[in-house]
Interface confidence: medium
């Protein structure tokens, strides 16, 4: 089993190295920024975020292109649930520094959780998307 696990690890590792998860990150960032815009923020206000989409993207065309490319990448993990989880964890980790505040982080995580389903793929079971956890209450 250990040998199999090692091979599984290597296979997943090389899949992750080959994959370009950037379109997923861009799609999700645009999605949460669009959501913020619809709550009254000026969509044309300048932003420091390097992923900040253009006004054209905000109308959805750029984002759907990113989504399509993202889904193509995630499709590679469809038959390996653990590797799919690792890909989602990687997206979360890559973006965690760019997310401003707990609200944006929760929003990003919510969209990330829905991503496999949006792509018509199975969500990985029991996948932990907390980046670095410290003692929080349930209630």
């Amino acid at each position: 089993r250990q040998q199999w696990e090692l091979q599984g690890d290597r296979r997943c590792q090389s899949q992750l190295e080959r994959a370009n998860l950037r379109p997923c990150e861009q799609h999700l960032m645009q999605k949460i920024q669009r959501d913020e815009d619809s709550y009254g923020r000026d969509p044309y206000s300048p932003s420091q975020d390097p992923y900040s989409p253009s006004p054209y993207d905000r109308r959805g065309a750029g984002s759907s292109q990113h989504q399509e490319r993202c889904c193509n990448e995630l499709n590679e993990f469809e038959n390996n649930q653990r590797c799919m989880c690792e890909a989602l964890q990687q997206i979360m980790e890559n973006q965690s520094d760019r997310l401003q505040g707990r609200q944006q982080e929760q929003q990003f995580k919510r969209e990330l959780r829905n991503l496999p389903q949006q792509c018509g793929l199975r969500a990985p079971q029991r996948c932990d998307l907390e980046v670095e956890s410290g003692g929080r209450d349930r209630y």
């Epitope: 089993r1 989880c85 932990d128 956890s133």
Partner: antibody, heavy 123, light 110 residues
Framework: EVQLVESGGGLVQPGGSLRLSCAAS????????MTWIRQAPGKGLEWVAN????????DYLDSVRGRFTISRDNAKSSLYLQMNSLRAEDTAVYYC????????????????WGQGTLVTVSS | QSVLTQPPSISAAPGQKVTISCSGT????????VSWYQQLPRTAPRLLIF???KRPSGIPDRFSGSKSGSSATLGITGLQTGDEAHYFC???????????FGGGTKLTVL
Amino acid sequence: EVQLVESGGGLVQPGGSLRLSCAASGFKFSTFYMTWIRQAPGKGLEWVANIKQDGSEKDYLDSVRGRFTISRDNAKSSLYLQMNSLRAEDTAVYYCTRNGLQDSYSGDFFDHWGQGTLVTVSS
Amino acid sequence: QSVLTQPPSISAAPGQKVTISCSGTGSNIGHNYVSWYQQLPRTAPRLLIFDNTKRPSGIPDRFSGSKSGSSATLGITGLQTGDEAHYFCATWDADLSAVLFGGGTKLTVL
């Protein structure tokens, strides 16, 4: 108040069979994963089997797969563990537990436990 | 031997703080949520922490959980004699398709 009451334990010879039952009350049984966990005398905890809310998915500990069968009757709020080809190493207190696992992005956790029923496999 | 490694025993004086570690691999703790249980002598275990950090209602905030990489930690502050018990960590293993428990840690309050 959530209650889980196990029954069916006892002394059985190696190779024999036993059926454990767990009567659940105080919560909507059909909306929870359920789990059997065992503890050999003086030892740690060992997960035995999980069953999904509708009974469509079951997972087993490697050493019991093919010998034990987990099942449930949501109409009766009851969980079962059919144990066949019992071995000395199956001797343990068997706990019926409610599993809080909800979706893809949550974990297994056992928030309510029965008092346990002792299964002794000996000749 | 358990795949999740815990120290077999620890001891500390009342009022002190202790941490109990639980170390695993990428296929279990690394990808999945961790829960912690307390078992007092001759009783069924009780859930202390679930989903790495969350406390069920009724569990005092002296108990906390954290996770980093493939290891998890249970923290107990303001130790009381009533905390003397066995503590177990648990998580799902994606390769084995099974829940794993740590071997347990016996906490003695001196």
